[in-house]
């Protein structure tokens, strides 16, 4: 079926940066100044995407491909195809409603986008904190308390004693 | 077609006042969080205040509180923000913003933007 349709469809012959014109008897024309078409076989194109005001240009609009916005510096992109921009905060701070906050102690934030998140728990894994997290960092873990203990070494430990009821083999 | 159309900056004196207005159309305006949001020259886009559908959360920036009050008239689809007070630092293009789909629950991102009016505080 796709090949037929092909065959009977003149316009499956456009490339992508034209449409198939109806008026000029189904011709591929070149999409026309801030247009374009990103795929072949299209009818029209498509307008290009104008990045003003806060959004500034990243990408130019071309015959085949849309224009890419992004977002004036103090905030960054969000959303598909940078529809929205969201407001940056300092390390160490998350967004709020009600602007740019601080992280609660025992989370962090290591970038200017995000919600603070919960230092580690080391003791979870049996090991010990070697740095303090602060606001901005977390936590580092290091070796389990028991191999920071004095007089430990690396000696394998003895066997455990056979239980009780079993003769030697 | 969805827009936002600031007015009512200009040239005042330190100390003075003046009335930003920013007026909606194309989108049911009293379902949307607004914003103010600045640009000072040379410096960062910086986030001012918002406001919720109803009026009862309003939110500043640490440097304006006390100074800036921001209102809004959903019967005239229009955003306002009273700034008293001014300083040479409160120099900058002042746009309103809509708070996008979802504002304040998942995300604070603003996806429709005036052009911005220029307010500029000198003696």
């Known amino acids: 079926f796709e090949r037929t349709r092909s065959l009977q469809d003149p316009c499956s012959n456009c490339p992508a940066g034209t449409f198939c014109d109806n008026n000029r008897n189904q011709i591929c024309s070149p999409c026309p100044p801030n247009s374009f078409s990103s795929a072949g076989g299209q009818r029209t194109c498509d307008i290009c995407r104008q990045c003003k005001g806060v959004f500034r240009t990243r990408k130019e609009c071309s015959s085949t491909s849309n224009a890419e916005c992004d977002c004036t510096p103090g905030f960054h992109c969000l959303g598909a195809g940078c529809s929205m921009c969201e407001q940056d905060c300092k390390q160490g701070q998350e967004l709020t409603k009600k602007g740019c906050k601080d992280c609660c102690f025992g989370t962090f934030n290591d970038q200017k986008r995000g919600i603070c998140r919960p230092w580690t728990n080391c003791s979870l894994d049996g090991k010990s904190v070697l740095v303090n997290g602060t606001k901005e960092r977390d936590v580092v873990c290091g070796p389990s308390p028991a191999d920071l203990s004095p007089g430990a070494s690396s000696v394998t430990p003895p066997a455990p004693a056979r239980e009780p009821g079993h003769s030697p083999q | 077609e969805v827009q936002l159309v600031e007015s009512g900056g200009g040239l005042v004196q330190p100390g003075g006042s003046l009335r930003l207005s920013c007026v909606a159309s194309g989108f049911n305006f009293s379902n949307y969080w607004m914003n103010w949001v600045r640009q000072a020259p040379g410096k960062e886009l910086e986030w001012v205040a918002n406001?919720?559908?109803?009026?009862?959360?309003?939110y500043y920036v640490d440097s304006v509180k006390g100074r800036f009050t921001i209102s809004r008239d959903n019967a005239k689809n229009s955003l306002f923000l009273q700034m008293n007070s001014l300083r040479a630092d409160d120099t900058a293009v002042y746009y309103c913003?809509?708070?996008?789909f979802g504002y304040g629950d998942s995300h604070f991102g603003m996806d429709v933007w005036g052009q911005g009016t220029t307010v500029t505080v000198s003696s």
């Open positions: 406001i919720n559908q109803d009026e009862s959360e309003k």
């Open positions: 913003a809509r708070g996008g």
